[in-house]
């Protein structure tokens, strides 16, 4: 894990803009784990950050991520019909100035250093799921979610016409 103490030093001043230049409605510092209780961890390797999905050893500290919640400012057409009310979007930052990004070309989830305003690739539609879980859908690619593949985070297409088991796109958020 890296630089996580830096997350604790975040202030609202660092998070005072979104796509439309407004503040997030709230923020939440949490550890991220899979439906099967594997931890999402972050490591610096060869001058770039890697994201892992792994079982932590007992008493090993979990990495924390700062979730910044935003209202979508207009009725969205994320669902393809343009009739939705407001939704919740989220950005995820495990350390100062770095955010999770959707790389739709490579179907990968990456950590990128960037300045405000954040690009659309850093925003995810937040889905409230049962079993105390959430899912993260790419703002830039409706129907594509952050998921787990081969002990890494990846982008996974969820097709409502297919009987997919979605445990691999379910995540738990925990303050501990």
């Amino acid at each position: 894990a890296f630089g996580i103490s830096g997350v604790q030093k975040y202030t609202r001043a660092l998070h005072d803009s979104s796509i439309t230049g407004i503040s997030p409605i709230t923020e939440y510092l949490a550890s991220l784990s899979t439906y099967n209780d594997q931890s999402i961890t972050f490591a610096l390797e060869d001058e770039s950050y890697e994201i892992y999905v792994e079982d932590l050893k007992k008493d090993e500290k979990k990495d924390k991520v700062l979730l910044s919640y935003y209202e979508s400012q207009h009725p969205s057409n994320e669902s393809g019909d343009g009739v939705d009310g407001k939704m919740l979007m989220v950005t995820l930052s495990p350390t100062k100035d770095f955010w999770l990004h959707a790389n739709n070309k490579e179907h990968s989830v990456e950590l990128h250093k960037c300045e405000k305003p954040l690009p659309d690739q850093a925003f995810f539609v937040l889905h409230n799921m049962h079993s105390n879980c959430v899912s993260f859908e790419c703002k830039t690619d409706p129907g594509v979610f952050i998921g787990v593949k081969d002990n890494h985070l990846a982008l996974i297409k969820v097709d409502s016409s297919e009987n997919l088991c979605t445990e691999n796109i379910l995540f738990k958020l925990s303050e501990t």
């Epitope: 949490a30 979730l67 409230n128 009987n163």
Partner: antibody, heavy 121, light 111 residues
Framework: EVQLVESGGGLVQPGGSLRLSCAAS????????MNWVRQAPGKGLEWMAE??????????HYAESVKGRFTISRDNSKNTVYLQMNSLRAEDTAVYYC????????????WGQGTLVTVSS | DIVMTQSPDSLAVSLGERATINCRAS??????????LNWYQQKPGQPPKLLIF???SQGSGVPDRFSGSGSGTDFTLTISSLQAEDVAVYYC?????????FGQGTKVEIK
């Protein structure tokens, strides 16, 4: 136009059964969790049942008061959600609203006009 | 089950004045750093309409005079300047846990 239209309400005797239907139009029905909410005459709102999506294995959830008596189901090919009500009691008398949760499942943002179910002998 | 209790049961407010409705949950409705608390307005003979979600975010097309606040167990809906068309019953609802539960409703009338 986004619309939910309920049907199937009416007068039924205690112990009887009724099947409510809700026809959805104007949106991609298969993308949304659907709910039933009821309101007894002159009373408040009571959430009844919910059904999720195919990729959630159509999981269903119920209020304790109707668990084992009511069954929610959906037919995406017909854009319709159903509520099968068995062993009806006088206290089930209410207007039954079909309702759609928003994309992301945070709140209900589309409601039908409701259908009245009266349980009486 | 989480029990939602609203106060007052009814409220008479002069046009242009502020109306405040309180909602208390029997346990915290917070999760993921958000409050799973919605407010709905219901006018006679109509289905409910969403006003506020996650405690303080306005629904689409909701006038700015409606605002929500609170977290944990205590929440407030405020109508900053009551209009004639705001006469209705207002319900809070928690969506943190199944069964989703509503408050008993608060009837708002013109004084």
């Amino acid at each position: 136009e986004v619309q939910l239209v309920e049907s199937g309400g009416g007068l039924v005797q205690p112990g009887g059964s009724l099947r409510l239907s809700c026809a959805a139009s104007g949106f991609t029905f298969s993308n949304y969790w659907m709910n039933w909410v009821r309101q007894a005459p002159g009373k408040g709102l009571e959430w009844m049942a919910e059904i999720t999506l195919k990729f959630n294995n159509y999981s269903t959830h119920y209020a304790e008061s109707v668990k084992g008596r009511f069954t929610i189901s959906r037919d995406n090919s017909k854009n319709t959600v159903y509520l099968q009500m068995n062993s009806l009691r006088a206290e089930d008398t209410a207007v039954y609203y079909c309702a759609r949760r928003n994309y992301g499942n945070w709140y209900i943002n589309v409601w039908g006009q409701g259908t009245l179910v009266t349980v009486s002998s | 089950d989480i029990v939602m209790t609203q106060s007052p049961d009814s409220l008479a407010v002069s046009l242009g004045e502020r109306a405040t409705i309180n909602c208390r949950a029997s346990e915290s409705v917070d999760k993921f750093g958000l409050s799973f608390l919605n407010w709905y307005q219901q006018k006679p003979g109509q289905p409910p309409k969403l006003l506020i979600f996650v405690a303080s975010s306005q629904g689409s097309g909701v006038p700015d005079r409606f605002s929500g606040s609170g977290s944990g167990t205590d929440f407030t809906l405020t109508i900053s300047s009551l209009q004639a068309e705001d006469v209705a019953v207002y319900y809070c609802q928690q969506s943190k846990d199944i069964p989703y539960t509503f408050g008993q409703g608060t009837k708002v009338e013109i004084k």
